[in-house]
Amino acid sequence: NWVNVISDLKKIEDLIQSMHIDATLYTESDVHPSCKVTAMKCFLLELQVISLESGDASIHDTVENLIILANNSLSSNGNVTESGCKECEELEEKNIKEFLQSFVHIVQMFINTS
């Protein structure tokens, strides 16, 4: 599932390159292992912003699929309460390219621990 999430992120990156979206997104670029589920939640919420701002059907479908995949992969620990983690709004705002790169890094963390 996580490998498919990375494929979807690459697809989103390719789709966005042909568009002009200037959004800045809350991005966790240095995820602590004890806050990875919280960080993933922030990434997924911000991904929905990309979908809405793009107005593109392919991006919309890919984001929706990515959320479905992540949900199923995290169904066992998605409701774990992580303490001492940053709120999404406390994270640094970065451009879409940097956001997607950081997203791939956190997904790699989940792959490495699964």
């Epitope: 997924l44 919420l45 979908s51 392919s58 890919t62 984001v63 929706e64 699929n65 959320i67 995290l74």
Partner: antibody
Framework: EVRLMASGGGLVQPGGSLRLSCAAS????????MSWVRQAPGKGLEWVAT????????YYPDSVKGRFTISRDNSKNTLYLQMNSLRAEDTAVYYC???????????????WGQGTLVTVSS | DVVMTQSPLSLPVTLGQPASISCRSS???????????LEWYQQRPGQSPRLLIY???NRFSGVPDRFSGSGSGTDFTLKISRVEAEDVGVYYC?????????FGQGTKLEIK
């Protein structure tokens, strides 16, 4: 008023195939994900398949995975369910339903067709 | 898979009286983004299912305000404040937070 008309049901032998159709009208079909849900005689509802707006992504329960294929033709405003290797336990009324977007709405099935009966028997 | 368990399976109610249906999931159905995709559907005799409530407590358009949804985590409830004759049928809860999406067994509401 949103309209969904399921068709294609009938009697088929075990191991046989059938293709169901669902004609959509009075809404922009390509803006919605779609699902199939079935109901065996006298039983409850069972989710069968979901397809994304553009048709790139499909989802199934294990009970039909590898045997059923959901697809769509947005130019014809039509949803399909190709059913292969049919079994007696696939006997049911099959409903098509429109899905609200997870991102912009509630991810619910807000409108349903009238259903088409599939009977698998020798 | 997430198992949805409804109770009671049969619910005889007097016209004008309240009714309550419980739905319990085998695990939390709060998804990673914090949403709970729990719906309630009504199926009148001989008819297709109809959406009543989505995301736990949101009433779908055209649904009378005597229907209300509540709950969180694993425990959910559909309430009808005053049952009317047209409410007869089977009520299903449904989760689509996690694939495979699953329905409860259904609760048959009938008039006493």
């Amino acid at each position: 008023e949103v309209r969904l008309m399921a068709s294609g049901g009938g009697l088929v032998q075990p191991g046989g195939s059938l293709r169901l159709s669902c004609a959509a009208s009075e809404f922009t079909f390509s803006n919605y994900a779609m699902s199939w849900v079935r109901q065996a005689p006298g039983k409850g509802l069972e989710w069968v398949a979901t397809i994304s707006r553009g048709g790139d992504y499909t989802y199934y329960p294990d009970s039909v995975k590898g045997r059923f294929t959901i697809s769509r033709d947005n130019s014809k405003n039509t949803l399909y369910l190709q059913m292969n290797s049919l079994r007696a336990e696939d006997t049911a009324v099959y409903y098509c339903a429109r899905r609200v977007s997870m991102i912009t709405g509630g991810w619910a099935m807000d409108y349903w067709g009238q259903g088409t009966l599939v009977t698998v028997s020798s | 898979d997430v198992v949805m368990t409804q109770s009671p399976l049969s619910l005889p109610v007097t016209l004008g009286q309240p009714a309550s249906i419980s739905c319990r999931s085998s695990q939390s159905i709060v998804d990673i983004t914090g949403n709970t995709y729990l719906e309630w559907y009504q199926q009148r005799p001989g008819q297709s299912p109809r959406l009543l409530i989505y995301k736990v407590f949101n009433r779908f358009s055209g649904v009378p305000d005597r229907f209300s949804g509540s709950g969180s985590g694993t425990d959910f409830t559909l309430k009808i404040s005053r049952v009317e004759a047209e409410d007869v049928g089977v009520y299903y809860c449904f989760q689509d937070s996690f694939v495979p999406y699953t329905f409860g067994q259904g609760t048959k509401l009938e008039i006493k």
